[in-house]
């Protein structure tokens, strides 16, 4: 039961995380105009990965896409790539994890196959989360660098006579959404990996069981101790004590073998 809960929770957390990564990637507020210690302007600038926007105080908002690939900074391209890779991996991970969920029965899929799929999706979620966190962090670093550069020359003068308003940008909402979403996807991935260990039908999964001999009729086969204690890999003797040596998860999943899809 605990493994199923861990797997299910990991899936839900990852799903929320990936939805957040997609939202962050699409958002326009990756960087927003810094209003502190700046001349009060009647326009508010903010920028995303795909377009830059200006909201006038009158309420009119105008957005312009970056209709160039070669003219964009390499860092911005790198951030775009990281976010897209994160989304693609996350989406594939979600697809794989749906089939890996213990509560969903597909034909006569072995627990070992579900365990492998759970591990695969978990790793995908971890990498997806790391991609998002990396992408957002690279962009944040770029902002910090540019912020201090523009602070150093806050006003560029023409012979000291004319002042130009230097628009400084600070962290936008999308960065925080991206960080949180990346973190959630990462956590979800870790949970999936933990759930995978509980799903794998290994000898080490068997709990210590006490066996009660009812009379002298019970014959202990030579390989029995070996299998029940978990030492060695004698698969033939694995289910010698089927009546007693079943883990909590096996009990729950047992009827599935006689079920229909």
């Amino acid at each position: 039961m605990a493994v199923t809960a861990c797997q299910g929770l990991g899936f839900v957390v990852s799903l929320i995380g990936i939805a957040g990564i997609i939202a962050a990637t699409c958002m326009d507020q990756w960087s927003t105009q810094d209003l502190y210690n700046n001349p009060v302007t009647a326009v508010f600038n903010y920028q995303g990965l795909w377009r830059s926007c200006v909201r006038e105080s009158s309420g009119f908002t105008e957005c312009r896409g970056y209709f160039t690939l070669l003219g964009l900074p390499a860092m911005l391209q790198a951030v775009r790539a990281l976010m897209i890779v994160g989304i693609v991996l996350g989406a594939i991970g979600l697809l794989v994890s749906i089939f890996a969920l213990k509560c969903i029965r597909i034909g006569s899929m072995e627990d070992s196959a579900k365990a492998n799929m759970t591990l695969t999706s978990g790793i995908m979620f971890i990498v997806s989360g790391l991609c998002a966190i990396a992408g957002v962090s690279v962009f944040a670093n770029m902002l910090v660098t540019n912020f201090w550069m523009s602070t150093a020359n806050m006003y560029t003068g023409m012979g000291g006579m004319v002042q130009t308003v230097q628009t400084r940008y600070t962290f936008g909402a999308a960065l925080f959404v991206g960080w949180v979403a990346g973190g959630l996807t990462l956590i979800g991935g870790v949970m999936m990996c933990i759930a995978c260990r509980g799903l794998a039908p290994e000898e080490t999964n068997y709990k210590a069981v006490s066996y009660h001999a009812s009379g002298h009729s019970v014959a202990y086969k030579p390989g029995g101790f070996k299998a029940s204690t978990g030492f060695g890999s004698n698969t033939k003797n694995k289910k010698i004590y089927d009546g007693g040596a079943r883990t909590e998860d096996e009990v729950q999943s047992y009827p599935s073998k006689h079920d229909y899809v």
């Epitope: 009647a42 920028q47 105080s57």
Partner: antibody, heavy 117, light 113 residues
């Protein structure tokens, strides 16, 4: 169609306060900002302040301490309140709607204010 | 505060003539975010409220004749009337719509010879 109409007391004694009302029609105050501009006799235009669609305000720095702009959305009215009036506050007071580029696309006909004892 | 300077203060012209008036701001009105200049031109005839002519320094308001052209960027702006008509006689004001306070220029008065 879009209309703005100012109404005020006309004559006010020095050191008194005044309230001018701008009643709008043809648009919503929740979607557009309304500015106040004055023009002393024979002189140029002077921007006083604005109340934006969201309710935030901005004022001319020299008049900020004496100015207050508010609105009643339900009545489609914008109010300009000014304290400690002096004779040089005598002017034609206009309200105007803000649109693209924060420019003023529609103006009221104006209301004359005379500050005199 | 930002200062808007208009020149000349008055212009005497003949009908059909090309007219150019200038407006200079003490700070740049260019916004890098949308590559627009936040300068507006108004026309005011005697006894009337001002009328919007041009916004974003060069965008003509609908209904404004195409003889009116706005140009310029940053701190220096120009309003050109390609062929002055009798109905164009008025005072022309430029306004900063970028940095508070949204100051107006002193105006350029256009008169007929």
């Amino acid at each position: 169609q879009v209309q703005l109409k100012e109404s005020g007391p006309g004559l006010v004694a020095p050191s008194q306060s005044l309230s001018i009302t701008c009643t709008v029609s043809g648009f919503s105050l929740t979607s557009y900002g309304v500015h106040w501009v004055r023009q002393p006799p024979g002189k140029g235009l002077e921007w006083l302040g604005v109340i934006w669609a969201g309710g935030s305000t901005n004022y001319d720095s020299t008049l900020m301490s004496r100015l207050s702009i508010s609105k009643d959305r339900s009545k489609s009215q914008v109010f300009l309140k000014m304290t400690s009036l002096q004779t040089d506050d005598t002017a034609m007071y206009y309200c105007a709607r803000s649109l693209y580029g924060n420019s003023f696309d529609h103006w009221g006909q104006g209301t004359t204010l005379t500050v005199s004892s | 505060d930002i200062v808007m300077t208009q020149s000349p203060s008055s212009l005497t012209v003949t009908a059909g003539e090309k007219v150019t008036m200038r407006c200079r701001s003490s700070q740049s009105l260019f916004n890098s975010g949308n590559q627009r200049n936040y300068l507006t031109w108004y026309q005011q005839k005697p006894g009337q409220p001002p009328k919007l002519l041009i916004y974003w320094a060069s965008t003509r308001e609908s209904g404004v004749p195409d003889r009116f052209t706005g140009s310029g960027s940053g701190t220096d702006f120009t309003l050109t009337i390609s062929s002055v008509q009798a109905e164009d006689l008025a005072v022309y004001y430029c306004q900063n719509n970028y940095i508070y306070p949204l100051a107006f220029g002193a105006g350029t008065k256009l008169e007929l010879k």
